[in-house]
């Protein structure tokens, strides 16, 4: 039960006090007791329950004619059963007894009131009235946890607007309200109670820029809302009528969890005694609700796809046709960003990452806009954000970014268990340098901080600075699987490619050509590739880099070798010893459920079939996956990217609720 106030009683004159239902109020009977009195007894109205404990011994008696010694070891507490119909309608009489004097009486007139701030602390999607209880002041994780949840109102329900809904202090319509969390103030008081008392709703100054609270005012024609708390306003006096009354508030978060904001927001209602005009108002009671701002959550390749994004650029019609066909097979919506909007920037994966936010009453997809800001920089804000589609960005918006700040360098694993630690929403993966140096690249600290602060997908730093482009999607991917952990990790593997080519040469296919059918490209015989010692040395280095990540992923995701599939792939080291794919990088694939869009490798044709395609199919088809090889050579591969780099996917949110996990 929540702590109420301390009431001091005195025989000199009657004491008037307010007692809030659900609170435990302490009664000080000793400090003003007559000097020659040694004990006391208590009588109460039926609506008051008094508890007396004497320590030592710590024994309890219920009230009656019993007398209790007047010493510091006595604790008197009271609670009220119901709200008062009129001011002071409940009475407590303290009788002080002494050996030589008649009893001296002290009177306490109590007004019982119900004042409670309620929100969906049980996370059912409904607000249930809660009396003042301690638990509302804490937010706990896990299936038995409690505490309310706020969404950052980061969508744009008004198509005419260019701003997010949380950037204005208006409520557009009932759709906008659904992005907010309901909070109800319930009051039950005597009719004249608020002539001598006031309620103030408030938020800590340190949190005022993270939240906005609207009060619903029920008009005859429509339900209108006005701002009562927000970035410019940490407190608001409430006009509350006496009697039984419910007041609704709609709460929106304005900021995601981040370095200096753990995501918790406490809203408090304080009851003030304003009956003494010449004295400052005194706090009589406080009730609080703690909200946690819902984190931004990424979705792995194992989640069902819902929408595919791709750019239309000069001469990529065939690529578009292939992606369109794949999206149709996977029953996905397809969104094509036209040339005039992408400004010749085809790298859809690098510009944004689509995740979601979730409260018990609402789930919202949210696009995380990378700070790379090239030709596609307007696409997330102008074309993706919209009604029920949120937006967030981090990092410097002008300069100061590296290639590792693009979101081809941001992936997430499927759900995993590592030892006895569960990651039911998977773990975020991003690439970094292996140590900082004058020219090393790393993901901007603001992005790293944001990702870590979400708490529910603990990030893992991989090593990707060895690549020309430097993105994790150049050497890894995940595909769904019907067995084991429900997925496989795919890793690019030079060792596997050399093994395959050696086998082909041993079978007499040493003259088979890589890059056959590619115009203006030096075709390479298998035997020449195998005998090129420089290329072998380069791939030995690449293998070491990938193996480093392999061990890191096994450790951090709790994987066994049998959870990993090696995809044959060669690389070459270019300027500044940075690696890029020697032939189209097959691991850089588009995963749409069981349908995979894999870069066509243009490997050696043996017995009428590309031996690289054949090998990959033999590895993936037993998992029930369908491989489609997409020609991206001229439009993507030679520009240092592949199918995954050129596409993006919105996926179905997890059925697992983030608040049920324990980070």
């Amino acid at each position: 039960m929540a702590q109420g106030t301390l009431i001091r009683v005195t025989p000199e004159q009657p004491t008037h006090a307010v007692c809030v239902l659900g609170t435990l109020t302490q009664l000080d009977v000793c400090s003003s007791a007559p000097e020659d009195c040694t004990s006391f007894s208590v009588n109460t109205s039926p609506g008051v329950v008094v508890d007396i404990a004497h320590s030592p011994p710590a024994k309890k008696k219920s009230t009656g004619s019993s007398t209790w010694p007047l010493d510091p070891g006595v604790e008197v507490t009271l609670t009220m059963k119901a709200a008062s119909g009129s001011t002071g309608d409940q009475k407590v009489q303290i009788s002080y007894h002494g050996p030589k004097t008649p009893p001296v009486k002290a009177l306490l007139y109590l007004t019982g009131v119900e004042i409670s701030l309620s929100a969906d602390i049980t996370r059912t999607g409904k607000v249930k009235p809660t009396r003042a209880v301690e638990d509302k002041r804490t937010w706990t994780w896990g299936p038995c946890g409690q505490g309310a949840i706020l969404l950052v109102n980061c969508d744009r329900d008004n198509p005419e607007s260019s701003a997010m809904d949380c950037e204005d202090d208006e409520v557009l319509d009932s759709k906008d309200l659904k992005d907010m969390s309901l909070m109800t103030l319930s009051t039950k008081t005597p009719q004249d109670f608020f002539t001598r008392h006031t309620l103030v709703l408030h938020v800590a100054r340190s949190e005022m820029d993270k939240v906005r609270v609207f009060q619903a005012t029920r008009g005859r024609l429509s339900s209108r809302c006005r701002v009562v708390l927000g970035p410019k306003q940490p407190s608001h006096y409430l006009m509350v009528p006496g009697g039984k009354h419910n007041m609704d508030f709609y709460v929106e978060a304005l900021a995601f969890p981040d370095t200096n904001f753990p995501g918790l927001i406490t809203l408090t209602v304080s009851m003030l005694d304003t009956s003494k005009l010449e004295l400052p108002e005194a706090v009589v009671f406080q009730d609080s609700v703690v909200f946690r701002v819902a984190p931004w959550i990424m979705t792995p390749n194992t989640q069902p796809p819902q929408e595919v994004y791709v750019c239309s650029i000069f001469e990529n019609e065939d690529f578009l046709k292939s992606v369109t066909a794949l999206a149709m097979q996977a029953r996905c919506k397809l969104t094509i960003c036209p040339e005039e909007e992408n400004m010749d920037d085809q790298w859809m994966q690098d510009e944004m990452e689509i995740g979601y936010i979730q409260a018990p009453h609402k789930t919202l997809p949210v696009v995380f806009d990378s700070p790379r800001n090239r030709g596609l920089k307007e696409f997330p804000i102008k074309r993706v954000m919209g009604p029920d589609f949120g937006y967030v960005t981090r990092g410097p918006q002008t300069g100061g970014v590296s290639g590792l700040d693009s979101f081809g360098n941001l992936e997430v694993s499927p759900p995993v268990t590592v030892g006895d630690k569960e990651y039911p929403l998977g773990r975020i993966l991003f690439g970094d340098s292996c140590y900082p140096s004058s020219d090393s690249r790393e993901m901007h600290q603001a992005l790293q901080d944001f990702l870590s602060a979400q708490q529910v997908q603990a990030p893992v730093k991989l090593y990707s600075d060895w690549l020309t482009v430097g993105h994790v999607d150049e050497f890894l991917s995940f595909v769904p699987a019907p067995d084991r952990k429900g997925f496989r990790l795919l890793l690019a593997s030079p060792r596997s490619c050399y093994k395959l080519f050696q086998e082909q040469q041993n079978e007499g296919h040493g003259d088979a050509l890589l890059f056959q059918g590619i115009k203006k490209k030096n075709q390479q015989k298998i035997k020449n590739i195998l005998s090129n010692t420089t290329l072998r040395e380069h791939n030995s280095f690449v293998e070491r880099c990938i193996d480093w990540n392999r061990e890191l992923l096994k450790r951090e995701l709790g994987l066994a070798e049998s959870d990993i599939i090696d995809i044959p792939q060669l690389f070459k080291l270019k300027e500044f010893s940075k690696a890029e794919a020697f032939f189209p990088n097959m691991v850089n694939m588009l995963v749409l459920g069981k349908h995979l869009g894999i870069p066509k490798p243009f490997g050696p044709i043996i017995n009428g079939r590309c031996c690289l395609e054949e090998k990959v199919c033999s590895l993936l088809e037993p998992l029930g996956l369908h491989c489609t090889f997409i020609n991206d050579f001229y439009t993507y591969h030679i520009r240092h990217g592949e199918v995954h780099c050129g596409t993006n996917v919105r996926r179905k949110p997890f059925s697992f609720k983030w608040w049920n996990m324990v980070p």
Partner: antibody, heavy 128, light 111 residues
Framework: QVQLVESGGGLVKPGGSLRLSCAAS????????VSWIRQAPGKGLEWVSF????????YYADSVRGRFTISRDNAKNSVYLQMNSLRAEDTAVYYC?????????????????????WGRGTLVTVSS | QSALTQPRSVSGSPGQSVTISCTGT?????????VSWYQQHPGKAPKLIIY???ERPSGVPDRFSGSKSGNTASLTISGLQAEDEADYYC???????????FGGGTKLTVL
């Protein structure tokens, strides 16, 4: 063959800033590595900065790191050198140079380390 | 002072051969095959004449040749001609924090 023209040089006070541009014609600059090289009056060549064709990494000489920023806008067929906190010793003719990033190369050709096309240069004078 | 060391000047008569040396360390010239040479006439931009130690861009006469031994690279110009009079700079990739180094330049005088 690509042709390069530098612009943006001029007189600036110590501590000031300048932005040099290198505009390409005759070819698409997105296929080229680009470096900035400078030459102080009567002195030798000094390599300043590099950006790769894919626009994914940059390198700087110790003498300018943290003050200069190289960037490229492939849509405008240009590369830029933003120079901040300029010092008297930054006075020089600044050359933009490039080398083609040939995807046909089977192994590292070293094209990022040599400059086969040069502009005529633009003079930057840092003086109070 | 420059990171790669070249002689300040060399000279030769028309028809003769001259060699310009470029000495570095095991972290640049000695480590990489990415040594290049540039010719610069007064008031003009430099011009690439040798790359990757010994390769010649198209249009550069075969009188110009490059080589490397240990930490030292060399440029040899045979059959000297009057128009060869210019400044010559060597350059190398380096594993230091400045990844491309130049020599201080050598003034070639054709007598």
């Amino acid at each position: 063959q690509v042709q390069l023209v530098e612009s943006g040089g001029g007189l600036v006070k110590p501590g000031g800033s300048l932005r040099l541009s290198c505009a390409a014609s005759g070819s698409t600059l997105s296929d080229y590595f680009v470096s900035w090289i400078r030459q102080a009056p009567g002195k030798g060549l000094e390599w300043v900065s590099f950006i790769n064709a894919a626009n994914t990494f940059t390198y700087y000489a110790d003498s300018v790191r943290g003050r200069f920023t190289i960037s490229r806008d492939n849509a405008k067929n240009s590369v830029y050198l933003q120079m901040n906190s300029l010092r008297a010793e930054d006075t020089a003719v600044y050359y933009c140079s490039s080398a083609n990033d040939d995807v046909d190369d089977i192994v590292a050709p070293g094209r990022g380390y040599y400059m086969d096309v040069w502009g005529r240069g633009t003079l930057v004078t840092v003086s109070s | 002072q420059s990171a790669l060391t070249q002689p300040r000047s060399v000279s030769g008569s028309p028809g003769q051969s001259v060699t310009i040396s470029c000495t570095g360390t095991s972290g640049d010239v000695g480590r990489y095959s990415h040594v290049s040479w540039y010719q610069q006439h007064p008031g003009k931009a430099p011009k690439l004449i040798i790359y990757n130690v010994y390769e010649r861009p198209s249009g550069v006469p075969d009188r110009f040749s490059g080589s490397k031994s240990g930490n030292t690279a060399s440029l040899t110009i045979s059959g000297l001609q009057a128009e060869d009079e210019a400044d010559y700079y060597c350059s190398s990739h380096s594993r230091s924090s400045t990844p491309v180094l130049f020599g201080g330049g050598t003034k070639l005088t054709v007598l």
